[in-house]
């Protein structure tokens, strides 16, 4: 029985050239988080394995930094970074939980963070 919920930063925006932290948090379960995958559409950005540590995809090594925590920091943002990002929590023994974040990269300096929301 999967009882957990993923809380994410929801819809967020950031300035071109700036950086942003993608964060998810798994709650309402005692399951052990064994691995978190960060993906953009079907492209793997990074993995944080509870035992093996971090793996950053070679194509993103220059612009992605691990953390804070299980989160991911995107740097040197471009308008092409606009889109959906997914945090995929692999847990034991529950299984897999997925959270969604939509990032909009703006040309101007009027970037505002959206409200947090939950995905069951």
């Amino acid at each position: 029985m999967m009882t957990g919920t993923i809380e994410t930063t929801g819809n967020i925006s950031a300035e071109k050239g700036g950086s942003i932290i993608l964060q998810c948090h798994l709650s309402s379960t005692t399951a052990q988080v064994t691995q978190v995958n960060w993906e953009q559409q079907d492209q793997l950005l990074a993995i944080c394995n509870a035992d093996l540590g971090w793996h950053i995809s070679p194509s993103f090594k220059d612009r992605v930094a691990p953390g804070p925590g299980l989160g991911l920091t995107l740097q040197s943002l471009t308008v092409n970074d606009t889109g959906e990002y997914f945090c995929i929590y692999h847990t034991y023994p529950d299984g897999t939980y997925t959270g969604r974040i939509f990032l909009e990269v703006l040309e101007s300096s009027v970037a505002e963070h959206g409200a947090r929301f939950q995905i069951p």
Epitope: T34, E39, L44, N49, A50, L52, H55, G95, T96
Partner: antibody, heavy 124, light 107 residues
């Protein structure tokens, strides 16, 4: 190059405990990777038994969890499997394997290297 | 747990022909899928990981594709040494699970 070698009794009596050891050569067991046990009953498919990380994190197949213990001995560079209360259904070839050797380069976890396997028969 | 289903159970192919093996996951595993080859009396050998990356020393005639729940292993031109049983396996979710296998036999 990393090599794995299983050892242990080939015959175990019903209700007893099956004990196997996997000796690792060419790599320090405490440097990383998962260390896994997988079995294959005669003429059947592969079944993952469980995996351990050198720090002590263990993950077991739910169907076997109540009977399985996997441990690591870093001083001997080996890891072990204990399966209690065995029955004829536990008769199988038991393999040890390395899991995660490609993780740091590619981010994927698979059973990269396998031992040759050891046949264990449960019979009185 | 994620259930892996392979089809067909047996595939009869002539040497030199193409073989296409399928593997389906009961829920999405993204591209976290591996393929193994096992010959009689031998341990399985890793062929493909990450759904499409060939392991070290694996010939180019072996290729993997797919993402999510549907995966394919293709052997472009079967050699005599390719007749064996092939298994797919998912990770990282625990428990690790294997498909039931596809036996590729000589037609």
């Amino acid at each position: 190059q990393v090599q794995l070698q299983e050892s242990g009794p080939g015959l175990v009596k019903p209700s007893e405990t099956l004990s196997l050891t996997c000796a690792v050569s060419g790599y320090s067991i405490s440097s990383g990777y998962y260390w896994a046990w997988i079995r294959q009953p005669p003429g059947k498919g592969l079944e993952w038994i469980g995996s351990i990380y050198h720090s002590g994190s263990t993950y077991y197949n739910p169907s076997l969890k109540s009977r399985v213990t996997i441990s690591v001995d870093t001083s001997k560079n080996q890891f072990s499997l204990k399966l209690s209360s065995v029955t004829a259904a536990d008769t199988a070839v038991y393999y040890c394997a390395i899991e995660g050797a490609n993780y740091y380069d590619f981010g994927y976890v698979a059973f990269d290297i396998w031992g040759q396997g050891t046949m264990v028969t449960v019979s009185s | 747990e994620i259930v892996m289903t392979q089809s067909p159970a047996t595939l009869s192919v002539s040497p030199g022909e193409r073989a296409t093996l399928s593997c389906r996951a009961s829920q999405s595993v993204s591209s976290n899928l591996a393929w193994y080859q096992q010959k009689p009396g031998q341990a399985p050998r890793l062929l493909i990981y990450g759904a499409s990356t060939r392991a070290t020393g694996i010939p180019a005639r072996f290729s993997g594709s797919g993402s999510g729940t549907e995966f394919t292993l293709t052997i472009s031109s079967l050699q005599s040494e390719d007749f064996a049983v092939y298994y797919c396996q998912q990770s990282p979710p625990w428990p690790r699970t294997f498909g039931g296998g596809t036996k590729v036999e000589i037609k």
